[in-house]
């Protein structure tokens, strides 16, 4: 049933008004990943801290088993940053037969899983070649955008190589979503 | 006291409703930094333009002395981009005894200061090794996420090296926050 | 006319309340670009998918001819990611007389056009030197911030080199805005 707002000369009909503090929201932070069996043909998913430090879930937005559960249909802003770190990549070695090498790379994907739909949907992808010479390297990939999500949708963050994720600080690697 | 929305067959109780245009918001833009005394063991904080050009503060969100002041408790989306530029970094020099060098790096931190709490809290960090060979370099670090902040909290942006911040254009380096 | 919220002992006046689901919003995704005549002294603008896949426009936010049209004055969060890919850049070749070369670069600009104002306004810029050795390269530039926009303003995304934009997947290159 539509809520109403009254004005002298006309009547505007809206969806029910609701307080902003009542909307589903979550900010998850990095934890050290434990080795797990990854699904074939899919980048491994990160698991997250959901209540300690800066992390929280509220207003029916729940975190379970690597997934954020969407409790209510609507438009959500979804974001993540993953900081990667590694040793010297080898992509700049001498090229055979003059051909450029396939570079090393790091990738983050925010994925939506809908139980009624067989294939996950990639919402956001950040992918970067890594070609560092003579040193260790570290760098973040940041993603964020708005999506129309349905009640029951599940969101996860997948990465190309879990062993390169910097898990040391909650401000370096994180994942969040909020209903607009 | 709770605000109420009336519907024919039931009554929903919410926190008081409020117009979105009434919420604390700020977008600050870069200005050239002047040499200052930095706090020991903390990256230096940037100061910002808060009213000229694209910059603004509104609805009791104030800027003073490098800090954004949070006027009301709630969940805020906080973001910043810092564009760095420098001359050739030295991290790719010949390595001694086959060991990788510690690379040059650039770092941005969005920090929360709570007067009643002795230590600042790092909300967001973007950190990147810089290993450029034979050229000038420039690149942005972008950060953004949602945090539960309290009235009286103060936010600032700290950087690893103030002298490498690109101060030339308001669209390259900026800092903002808004109540959700 | 101002909407009112009544409380027992005082009266607070707000701008009219409105349901969040009724606000202008858009998320546009990459399509393959067709060669066009670019404006002199301005980076070329990308055109976008606005209804297929993850893309949508709603609540009077329309997309037409490379522009997002702002249907209502207010504060908007505006974001974009562009993923670039290319072959080896030449910026790290042997330097003449020991001087650093001017590096290759990639740039994304989110631009506002106001019909009553002769010059476009650059809202956001992400610019990055590209200096990769011996391989293909790819990397994203992400931008996002809040701006006060006026009804009738138009937003576009300009890039330094259209031919380097990765148009293969809707999750890699995108552009969006929503009224706060």
């Amino acid at each position: 049933l539509k809520g109403q707002e009254f004005a002298p000369s006309h009547q505007q009909v809206y969806a029910p008004l609701r307080a902003d503090g009542d909307k589903p929201r979550a900010h998850l932070t990095v934890v050290r990943q434990t080795p797990t069996q990854h699904l074939k043909n899919q980048f491994p998913a990160l698991h997250w801290e959901h209540e300690l430090g800066l992390a929280f879930t509220k207003n029916r937005m729940n975190y379970t088993n690597k997934f954020l559960l969407i409790p209510e249909s609507g438009d959500y802003f979804v974001y993540s940053q993953v900081t990667f770190r590694g040793m010297t990549s080898e992509c700049s070695e001498i090229r055979q037969a003059g051909r450029p090498n396939k570079p090393d790379s790091i990738t983050v994907v925010i994925t939506k899983v809908t139980d009624s739909y067989p294939e996950p949907t990639q919402l956001l992808m950040g992918t970067k070649s890594v070609c560092e010479v003579g040193s260790n390297w570290f760098q973040p990939i940041y993603l964020g955008a708005m999506f129309s999500l349905q009640e029951g949708d599940k969101l996860m963050v997948n990465v190309s190589d879990i062993s390169l994720v910097d898990y040391t600080k909650e401000d370096k690697t994180f994942f969040g979503a909020f209903l607009l | 006291l709770k605000g109420q929305e009336f519907a024919p067959s039931h009554q929903q109780v919410y926190a008081p409703l409020r117009a979105d245009g009434d919420k604390p918001r700020a977008h600050l833009t870069v200005v050239r930094q002047t040499p200052t005394q930095h706090l020991k063991n903390q990256f230096p904080a940037l100061h910002w333009e808060h009213e000229l050009g694209l910059a603004f503060t509104k609805n009791r969100m104030n800027y003073t002395n490098k800090f954004l002041l949070i006027p009301e408790s709630g969940d805020y989306f906080v973001y910043s981009q810092v564009t760095f530029r420098g001359m050739t970094s030295e991290c790719s020099e010949i390595r001694q005894a086959g060991r990788p060098n510690k690379p040059d790096s650039i770092t941005v931190v969005i920090t929360k200061v709570t007067d009643s709490y002795p230590e600042p809290t790092q909300l967001l960090m973007g950190t990147k090794s810089v290993c450029e060979v034979g050229s000038n370099w420039f690149q942005p670090i972008y950060l953004g996420a949602m945090f539960s902040l309290q009235e009286g909290d103060k936010l600032m942006v700290n950087v690893s090296d103030i002298s490498l911040v690109d101060y030339t254009k308001e669209d390259k380096t900026f800092f903002g926050a808004f109540l959700l | 006319l101002k909407g009112q919220e009544f409380a027992p002992s005082h009266q607070q006046v707000y701008a009219p309340l409105r349901a969040d689901g009724d606000k202008p919003r858009a998320h546009l995704t990459v399509v393959r670009q067709t060669p066009t005549q670019h404006l002199k002294n301005q980076f070329p603008a990308l055109h976008w998918e606005h209804e297929l896949g993850l893309a949508f426009t709603k609540n009077r936010m329309n997309y037409t001819n490379k522009f997002l049209l702002i249907p209502e004055s207010g504060d908007y969060f505006v974001y974009s990611q562009v993923t670039f890919r290319g072959m080896t850049s030449e910026c790290s070749e042997i330097r003449q007389a020991g001087r650093p070369n001017k590096p290759d670069s990639i740039t994304v600009v989110i631009t506002k056009v106001t019909d009553s104002y002769p010059e476009p306004t650059q809202l956001l810029m992400g610019t990055k030197s590209v200096c990769e050795v011996g391989s293909n390269w790819f990397q994203p530039i992400y931008l996002g911030a809040m701006f006060s926009l006026q009804e009738g303003d138009k937003l576009m995304v300009n890039v330094s080199d259209i031919s380097l934009v990765d148009y293969t997947k809707e999750d890699k290159t995108f552009f969006g805005a929503f009224l706060l």
Epitope: - | R32, Q33, T34, P35, T36, Q37, H38, P44, G86, M87, E90, N136, D161, I162, S163, L164, V165, Y167, T168, K169 | R99, P100, K102
Partner: antibody, heavy 118, light 107 residues
Framework: EVQLVQSGAEVKKPGASVKVSCKAS????????MHWVRQAPGQGLEWMGW????????NYAQKFQGRVTMTRDTSISTAYMELSRLISDDTAVYYC???????????WGQGTMVTVSS | DIVMTQSPSSLSASVGDRVTITCRAS??????LNWYQQSPGKAPKILIY???RLQSGVPSRFSGSGSGTDFTLAISSLQPEDFATYYC?????????FGPGTKLEIK
């Protein structure tokens, strides 16, 4: 108050070396690049190079490469510029300068006059 | 090296006049252009940074414009203390280079 205070005037013979000091105060010395700029009598400004006081890294203009050495002592917040194999054309006022960014100069020393004469 | 040229090399004007000085770079330097004022016997003082942004504490009668290769310094209403030599300087690439200067004299 941010200040750069330079050493006093010098008179040198051709072929000799000169070392000018620049003591910084009022700001974090290691946080900002220190530049050296010279100005011959009645002439314009000429950038000689910089030192990054934090790392000690330097960047010299090609013209002075091999003749100039920039160093620093962080314990006393002082930068030094040494120019060797002096010739009469090196007669100039030598300024140290720093700024909030590495590419511009907000704060200047008072200048040190170096005269090269036989 | 990037070569900076300035014009005119000198000009005469009166208190209250509007004057402009131009600076040209031999290649694009984006917005990495600074303007300095130097009075006789003194160290230079920065006026404008980033081609168009006024340094804190500098009077608003000074303004800068331009990007790429062509830049302008304008003084809207000359004051007695403005009679000095003005230099542009590029910060895009090392070696940083200055223009040869423009001497502004009282008519």
């Amino acid at each position: 108050e941010v200040q750069l205070v330079q050493s006093g005037a010098e008179v040198k013979k051709p072929g000799a070396s000169v070392k000018v000091s620049c003591k910084a105060s009022g700001y974090t010395f290691t946080g900002y690049y220190m530049h050296w700029v010279r100005q011959a009598p009645g002439q314009g400004l000429e950038w000689m190079g910089w030192i990054n006081p934090k790392s000690g890294g330097t960047n010299y203009a090609q013209k002075f490469q091999g003749r100039v050495t920039m160093t620093r002592d962080t314990s006393i917040s002082t930068a030094y510029m040494e120019l060797s194999r002096l010739i009469s054309d090196d007669t100039a006022v030598y300024y140290c300068a720093t700024g909030g960014s590495f590419d511009a100069f907000d704060v200047w020393g008072q200048g040190t006059m170096v005269t090269v004469s036989s | 090296d990037i070569v900076m040229t300035q014009s005119p090399s000198s000009l005469s004007a009166s208190v209250g006049d509007r004057v402009t000085i131009t600076c040209r770079a031999s290649q694009s330097i984006s917005s990495y252009l600074n303007w300095y004022q130097q009075s006789p016997g003194k160290a230079p003082k920065i006026l404008i940074y980033g081609a168009s942004r006024l340094q804190s504490g500098v009077p608003s009668r000074f303004s800068g414009s331009g990007s790429g290769t062509d830049f302008t310094l304008a003084i809207s209403s000359l004051q007695p203390e403005d009679f000095a030599t003005y230099y542009c300087q590029q910060g895009d690439n090392t070696p940083f280079t200055f223009g040869p200067g423009t001497k502004l004299e009282i008519k």
